[in-house]
Amino acid sequence: VPRWRQQWSGPGTTKRFPETVLARCVKYTEIHPEMRHVDCQSVWDAFKGAFISKHPCNITEEDYQPLMKLGTQTVPCNKILLWSRIKDLAHQFTQVQRDMFTLEDTLLGYLADDLTWCGEFNTSKINYQSCPDWRKDCSNNPVSVFWKTVSRRFAEAACDVVHVMLNGSRSKIFDKNSTFGSVEVHNLQPEKVQTLEAWVIHGGREDSRDLCQDPTIKELESIISKRNIQFSCKNIYRPDKFLQCVKNPEDSSCTSEI
């Protein structure tokens, strides 16, 4: 007799989730010598322990503490790039500018990037059928709590000038309900972070508007200023040229505004 299973509104756990996490961990520790000491089996056990046998709407940051401890990593605090709704370009940027880091360039962010997972209360099974949706079901689900936890820690670790890449094509360039707007902005430490510099990425080829004057950017400026952190904003009119100039800064066309 098939056992009754809770039907959630979101997609189920990514197929081959345990194998994917383990494989990513092995790959990451091979590429990053400073993380070679990490025991990937222990990392998987801690990851699994955070959500297996627990109600997927009742996950806490505390559940992830063993994983956080195992994944402890020192990132140069003045080389942090945050992003909101523009992940691909942010990742392309740090692939070229190798001394800068997004959350997904850290071990824990790399392990979970683009994956979904959840378990079921009182059973050791992983739920591959469905997982809670943040809006329709509950916010304290395994995936949301994970990203909230690692994002908070990543923001708390930042210092000096912190950069954030924002999508200028969206109606809300700065969205206070995004992970950046709801978690990271509020966990930057004013005693450590000197300036938040926003890079607003333009989508349209002929878009010459100053998106730094957008009302949502003004809202971000206000939030940051109230926290006694300085604010700066730059328009990136040509993201393609921007990346090209990061690759080849000596190029003569890279002195003009991008």
């Epitope: 020192t74 605090c77 670790a157 000038v161 005693e191 450590k192 000197q194 300036t195 700066s232």
Partner: antibody, heavy 116, light 111 residues
């Protein structure tokens, strides 16, 4: 190149007021806060506080609250330190230094002498 | 406030030898593995010059004879080999927690 240039030495009497300037060049002034550091003759360094050059919000260390004030003229990329009701123990060299919390850029220092 | 205790207060070293200056903080100055401890050199009549930031990062333009190490509460500035131009007072400074504080200084002289 980045430079912080401070105003010249001052000789003041007790009870008077002095205002020291620190003019920044070579970078966007409003991107980095400005700190003030005191060094009494033959003594060590003491952080007085800093001013947020974007908002103008000053943070004054407890030991300097009351007679010491930080201000800005953003259009001139200049930060100011004002000391009111000068006392003999205010005799010192005052440095401006650019944030972040480690100071790679310093002004040359302004010697303030308080003497009757 | 975080108190920084430097030792020794005076240090005399022969040219070409190693100089080691210690700085102990009254509480940890670490944040997620980054140590907010910095080192400066000051010569008479001049402003301090940043040598090392965040415990072990060599400031641009500073010779590699200068190095910094340590974490949490115990930090060391090493000069190896010492040159005549290194005669100065050296200060540690923390920016982990306001108010930022400096150590009392260490005067380096040549034996």
């Amino acid at each position: 190149q980045i430079q912080l240039v401070q105003s010249g030495p001052e000789l003041k009497k007790p009870g008077e007021t002095v205002k020291i300037s620190c003019k920044a060049s070579g970078y966007t002034f409003t991107n980095y806060g400005m700190n003030w550091v005191k060094q009494a003759p033959g003594k060590g360094l003491k952080w007085m506080g800093w001013i947020n050059t974007y908002t103008g919000e000053p943070t004054v260390a407890d030991d300097f609250k009351g007679r010491f004030a930080f201000s800005l003229d953003t259009s001139a990329s200049t930060a100011y330190l004002q000391i009111n009701n000068l006392k003999n123990e205010d005799t010192a060299t005052y440095f401006c230094a650019r944030n972040p919390g480690w100071f790679a850029y310093w002004g040359q220092g302004t010697l303030v002498t308080v003497s009757a | 406030d975080i108190v920084l205790t430097q030792s020794p207060v005076f240090l005399a070293v022969s040219l070409g030898q190693r100089a080691t200056i210690s700085c102990r903080a009254s509480e940890s100055v670490d944040n997620y593995g980054n140590s907010f401890m910095h080192w400066y050199q000051q010569k008479p009549g001049q402003p301090p010059k940043l040598l090392i930031y965040r415990a072990s990062n060599l400031e641009s333009g500073i010779p590699a004879r200068f190095s910094g190490s340590g974490s949490r509460t115990d930090f060391t500035l090493t000069i190896n080999p010492v040159e005549a131009d290194d005669v100065a007072t050296y200060y540690c400074q923390q920016s982990h927690e306001a108010p930022w504080t400096f150590g009392g200084g260490t005067r380096l002289e040549i034996k």
